[in-house]
């Protein structure tokens, strides 16, 4: 097992999950850890505990390894980090990779007020309702940026979008969560359509830093606590 030595550490590896950081309960997921060509061992940690290791064979590429989780459950959802060893030295820890299990217990209902097709600049609010009591709701825009809105609520949460712009167009789903890494089944998708004239610059989306309460859930965050931009369904954390 890795021994912490702050002196003389190797650069941190990159960690990512395929096909996604969100995994349906019972499905498999691959966690990749990319270090150095000279690496003799990679170790994967889960919630701070030693989870798995791999000693790459010299015949294979040694700069990255794949850790396979055969069945994702609430017991394997959470924060993963990896390290690698080269010679006598260990690397620094990778950035945290936060894996979420979905498909637990129940399916929420998602709807949009006043309606799914609105004109540019109209105020829009999404509502997410789950029969089983939960602690937090998450609203995701499919194939968009990585922004994930969250709201606390027992059975229902509302997500005010404010005056909508063309950037709000797209398909949304919501989840109820039982903890930050254990989510319900996804709601049926709701597609928001925006009609209207030429977009006015005064209707541009609010600077996200002014609404951290909506956007704070960090599956992988940069310094401001906002989501990094990258394809949501294939997430890599690095640097």
């Amino acid at each position: 097992q890795r021994i912490n030595t702050e002196k003389e550490t190797l650069p941190k590896p990159i960690i990512w999950a395929k096909p996604s950081i969100m995994v349906t309960n019972g499905n498999s997921v691959n966690i990749w850890c990319q270090g150095a060509q000279s690496a003799s061992e990679y170790q994967l940690y889960f919630e701070g505990s030693f989870f798995a290791l791999e000693r790459p064979k010299p015949s294979r590429s040694m700069n990255k390894v794949r850790f396979f989780i055969s069945q994702m459950t609430s017991h394997t959802a959470g924060i993963y980090t990896c390290f690698y060893q080269s010679g006598e030295l260990w690397s620094k820890s990778s950035n945290p990779l936060k894996l979420v299990v979905t498909g637990l217990y129940d399916t929420p209902n998602l709807w949009v007020y006043p309606r799914p097709e609105v004109t540019l600049g109209e105020n829009v609010t999404f509502f997410c309702q789950l029969k089983t009591a939960t602690s937090k709701f998450f609203l995701l825009k499919e194939r968009g940026s990585n922004h994930i809105q969250n709201k606390y609520g027992n059975i229902q949460a509302e997500f005010p979008m404010g005056p909508v712009t063309r950037a709000h167009r797209g398909t949304y789903r919501c989840f109820g969560s039982y903890n930050d890494y254990a989510w319900s089944f996804p709601s049926e998708p709701v597609t928001l359509l925006i009609t209207g004239g030429v977009e006015n610059s005064s209707l541009a989306p609010t600077d996200p830093t002014s609404s951290l309460d909506y956007w704070e859930f960090d599956l992988s965050t940069n310094e401001s606590g906002l989501q990094k931009d990258s394809a949501f369904w294939d997430h890599t954390t690095q640097n």
């Epitope: 989870f51 798995a52 794949r66 396979f68």
Partner: nanobody, 126 residues
Framework: EVQLVESGGGEVQPGGSLRLSCAAS????????MGWFRQAPGKEREFVAA???????YYAESVKGRFTISRDNAKNTVYLQMSSLRAEDTAVYYC????????????????????WGQGTLVTVKP
């Protein structure tokens, strides 16, 4: 569906040896990573040893040099050879499998394992 059945437990004196076996049903054994865990009375289950599908091994510090894990894919069986046994090795020993797995992965955390045996009791006393 994989079923794991442990055998070989029993009572032994300090310094003695035992070999535990874990027989797996099904044709997926060769693609499984295997592990042994143990649980002493009143304590949490702890990792003992693990072996990858390509025979790489890893041991808990407390058993390193005394226990050896091995597998026989032809017999669908994994073994734990235990020697220089101590009173603190007294526990129920569980065999576990990760099916399927990939490459050379060795799993140390119990959450990684998706199949478990019922356990076999090992008692070390004078």
């Amino acid at each position: 569906e994989v079923q794991l059945v442990e055998s070989g437990g029993g009572e032994v004196q300090p310094g003695g040896s035992l070999r535990l076996s874990c027989a797996a049903s099904g044709r997926t054994f060769a693609s499984a990573a295997m592990g042994w865990f143990r649980q002493a009375p009143g304590k949490e289950r702890e990792f003992v040893a693990a072996i990858s599908r390509s025979d790489d091994t890893y041991y808990a510090e407390s058993v390193k040099g005394r226990f050896t894990i091995s597998r026989d894919n032809a017999k669908n069986t994994v073994y734990l050879q235990m020697s220089s046994l101590r009173a603190e090795d007294t526990a129920v020993y569980y065999c576990a499998a990760v099916v399927p797995t990939y490459g050379n992965n060795i799993y140390v955390h119990s959450a990684a394992y998706n199949y478990w045996g019922q356990g076999t009791l090992v008692t070390v006393k004078p």
